[in-house]
Amino acid sequence: SERCDDWGLDTMRQIQVFEDEPARIKCPLFEHFLKFNYSTAHSAGLTLIWYWTRQDRDLEEPINFRLPENRISKEKDVLWFRPTLLNDTGNYTCMLRNTTYCSKVAFPLEVVQKDSCFNSPMKLPVHKLYIEYGIQRITCPNVDGYFPSSVKPTITWYMGCYKIQNFNNVIPEGMNLSFLIAFISNNGNYTCVVTYPENGRTFHLTRTLTVKVVGSPKNAVPPVIHSPNDHVVYEKEPGEELLIPCTVYFSFLMDSRNEVWWTIDGKKPDDIPIDVTINESISHSRTEDETRTQILSIKKVTSEDLKRSYVCHARSAKGEVAKAATVKQKVPAPRYTVEGGGGTGGLNDIFEAQKIEWHEGGGHHHHHHHHHH
């Protein structure tokens, strides 16, 4: 056979469909690989050919379009299953060709089973709703093109095993599910089942998505630096380890990039000739507000290092903030001796207790335990 532009196996399009449901799969050539659409190709005399390789087989075989009730058919650039069977799983290839031109791409199709509560290995899209934000809707996804607009399907919405009816704040409205006000308790998996008739048969389309209730933009604030702050002084002797945590709270913001970084004397730590390590940990609240902690660590600090300026910076779509840490060189405690006693006096014990960090304005000593991640 003559040469064909082979785009290989398009694993980016890991198509999953439910067993015993209709599926319409567009040839990816026109979506991602070629600069013209099917209509143009067809009018230029190009033919679209489909074939497949069964799961765990190497043999390419033609697709059987002569099955009872036209279970598998092709319409323009779409391969139709009415409905799918479990053993339809495999790699499907669509090839566009004429005598002088050939281009093909393969993609994996996985037919998956679901249980009566709609649990399955299907990867679920996530839809984020703002907490206590007013009416928000989700729409039953990927049902376009399955039936003409003249057909009026029935749509039933479920949360897990349970039909959504009589819920306090969630109302099914056809293809939409309206959340009058979203709370944390609305987190979970929501399923729409679309039932429609076609040629005397009844088909079901099942679509599940995950709803995640997140912080509202009404409550969003610029980043808040909790540490360093004006109350903590990092007082060290040369040779000791200097550990300064930068802890920043970020409100949830859709598609915002949250950043935390240190500067030392106005430069990035990488640009300073000292041995600095920075460890970052990230935690999230239930509404996806984020707390980032970056611990700046200098194993053996020098007198010069203790004179430098250490500034924590944070940025989100809401703004940028910065806070300097108060770093000081510890003044050696004077040695007091008691005449004839030969021991150190009580003052020396107090100085010994005044270790590492101290809080200004108060007499409380805090021992900070930093966990590296």
């Epitope: 249980d115 009566s116 509560c117 897990g160 095993c161 039909k163 306090n168 308790s185 609305n186 979970g188």
Partner: antibody
Framework: QVQLVQSGAEVKKPGSSVKVSCKAS????????IQWVRQAPGQGLEWMGY????????DYAQKFQGRVTITADESTSTAYMELSSLRSEDTAVYYC???????????????WGQGTLVTVSS | EIVMTQSPATLSVSPGERATLSCRAS??????LAWYQQKPGQAPRLLIY???TRATGIPARFSGSGSGTEFTLTISSLQSEDFAVYYC?????????FGQGTKVEIK
Amino acid sequence: QVQLVQSGAEVKKPGSSVKVSCKASGSPAEPYAIQWVRQAPGQGLEWMGYIIPSLGGYDYAQKFQGRVTITADESTSTAYMELSSLRSEDTAVYYCARGQTLYETGRQFDIWGQGTLVTVSS
Amino acid sequence: EIVMTQSPATLSVSPGERATLSCRASQSVSSNLAWYQQKPGQAPRLLIYGASTRATGIPARFSGSGSGTEFTLTISSLQSEDFAVYYCQQYNNWPWTFGQGTKVEIK
């Protein structure tokens, strides 16, 4: 460990109503459903309905529509089943049951209350 | 609604013997079937769900099989504590329905 504790036995007159409570301890953060099932003396199990306390959703078996009301008080983790227009054939042990989440297929009757005997007699 | 029919109504078995209980659905329930055990004066206890998966803490002598409309609960070697009433339940379609029960008694 999740437990369901039900209210005590009741004796009721025909035509009256009964309200049985079911208190959950050790409730998880995730929404769950409380089911109500009854069992007449020497008979099998009969599903009556459910409620999802944190979301308010409920449904009743067709047979009990109009006579049963299932409610819940989230603040006390307590569900209630009220049956009205009682007749002698409503004499039964009434059970509440629940699963851990709304998603566990086949495990929606994982944990059971001890049962409440309701006797309807004139 | 789906009607669940259990047979036999009563099964007389000697301790140590095998017991086989049947449950039939009036229409296919796939594998969406559970089995419960109930002893006198107690609440039912979940034994099997998904037709064949043992619930937490259920001994291996209990096993379930079947799909569609025909299901079986097998107790491989009856212990004294296994004499009870057993119910099947379908959760494929609302309303969820129970069988009328099979009483397993000492022979």
